[in-house]
């Protein structure tokens, strides 16, 4: 039986103020059943980031198209980056639920500093 | 080719039971969910239950009567039903699911069902 | 529950003819909706899913459209293969999956 791996390959994401950062997360199951949603940091106090189902991210796209079928790509772009989105982002899936979705499983993160400006 | 096919119906007596299974071929089963909708003679569709990987969804009206399950192994859907009553009459249909996008499931193949009928 | 509405009940039509069908929501279901159609003695196909997407094989004179609780299944020039049972789904909040009532195609 396949166990769903939650894949981010990049442990450390060095971007530039005023551009775009690509968060990757890909999946090897679409099981079980649920969504796929990202956040800044762990705990209660954790930030959402991106909810595909319900939301206004009015800076954040998704990489894959959202009409393709069978999808286990959630990445994300994170568009005009500021100091204040340092920190660690998960992708985090989710079992569904009645009527609250439970939390199955977290990627390892990918943490998002600052890098260096261009000369 | 994505093929299912389904097999146990039959005539059943009122408290009865039945098991039913869809043999699946032609997709990676053991990473879909796969569900159970009926149509009972005459009228519309009706979903009665999906499985993921070990988690179970049930339409109310055979929530503890019913248990779906599956056998990644043998590529094979089951469905066993106790309990039966008159209302359960109908074509059980077997049916993969597929999601668009991040989440949300429908179904993109059916099997040709098998008839349950419960009758005294 | 989220309840689906479909009209009309049947539509008699002539082959070549423009079909409109209507399904409509309870409540918003986003653009969470796929069209299946279902011919005397058969299982059900799918046509359309997330309300606009043609499932592969399907032929183009099928087109879906709307958002929140208002959708259409439009076929552009009837053809007598086309007749038969058209059925909408809602895939935004389950369980329960939910299905139209149904509505009939049938030759005038």
């Known amino acids: 039986e396949e166990e769903l791996q939650m894949i981010q390959p990049e442990k450390l994401l060095l971007v530039t103020v005023g551009k775009t950062a690509t968060l990757h997360c890909t999946v090897t199951s679409l099981l079980p059943v649920g969504p796929v949603l990202w956040f800044r940091g762990v705990g209660p106090g954790r930030e959402l980031i991106y909810n595909q189902k319900e939301g206004h991210f009015p800076r954040v796209t998704t990489v894959s198209d959202l009409t393709k079928r069978n999808n286990m790509d959630f990445s994300i772009r994170i568009s005009s980056i500021t100091p204040a989105d340092v920190g660690t982002y998960y992708c985090v899936k989710f079992r569904k639920g009645s009527p609250e979705n439970v939390e199955f499983k977290s990627g390892p993160g990918t943490e998002m500093a600052l890098g260096a400006k261009p000369s | 080719e994505v093929q299912l096919v389904e097999s146990g119906g039959g005539v059943v007596q009122p408290g009865g039971s039945l098991r039913l299974s869809c043999a699946a071929s032609?997709?990676?089963?053991?990473?879909?969910?796969v569900s159970w909708v009926r149509q009972a003679p005459g009228k519309g569709l009706e979903w009665v239950s999906t499985?993921?990987?070990?988690?179970?969804y049930y339409a109310d009206s055979v929530k503890g009567r019913f248990t779906i399950s599956r056998d990644n192994s043998k590529n094979t859907l089951y469905l066993q039903m106790n309990s039966l009553r008159a209302e359960d009459t109908a074509v059980y249909y077997c049916a993969k699911d597929s999601t668009v996008g991040w989440s949300g499931d429908f179904f993109d193949y059916w099997g040709q069902g098998t008839l349950v009928t419960v009758s005294s | 529950e989220i309840v689906l509405t479909q009209s009309p009940a049947t539509l008699s039509v002539s082959p070549g003819e423009r079909v409109t069908l209507s399904c409509r929501a309870s409540?918003?279901?986003?653009?969470?909706i796929a069209w299946y159609q279902q011919k005397p003695g058969q299982a059900p196909r799918l046509l359309i899913y997330?309300?606009?997407s043609r499932d592969t094989g399907i032929p183009a004179r099928f087109s879906g459209s709307g958002s929140g609780t208002d959708f259409t299944l439009t076929i552009s020039s009837l053809q007598s293969e086309d007749f038969g049972v058209y059925y909408c789904q809602q895939y935004y909040d389950w369980p329960p999956f939910t299905f139209g009532g149904g509505t009939k195609v049938e030759i005038k």
């Open positions: 499985i993921g990987a070990d988690d179970t």
């Open positions: 409540q918003n279901v986003r653009s969470d």
């Open positions: 997330a309300a606009s």
């Open positions: 032609g997709f990676s089963f053991s990473i879909y969910a």
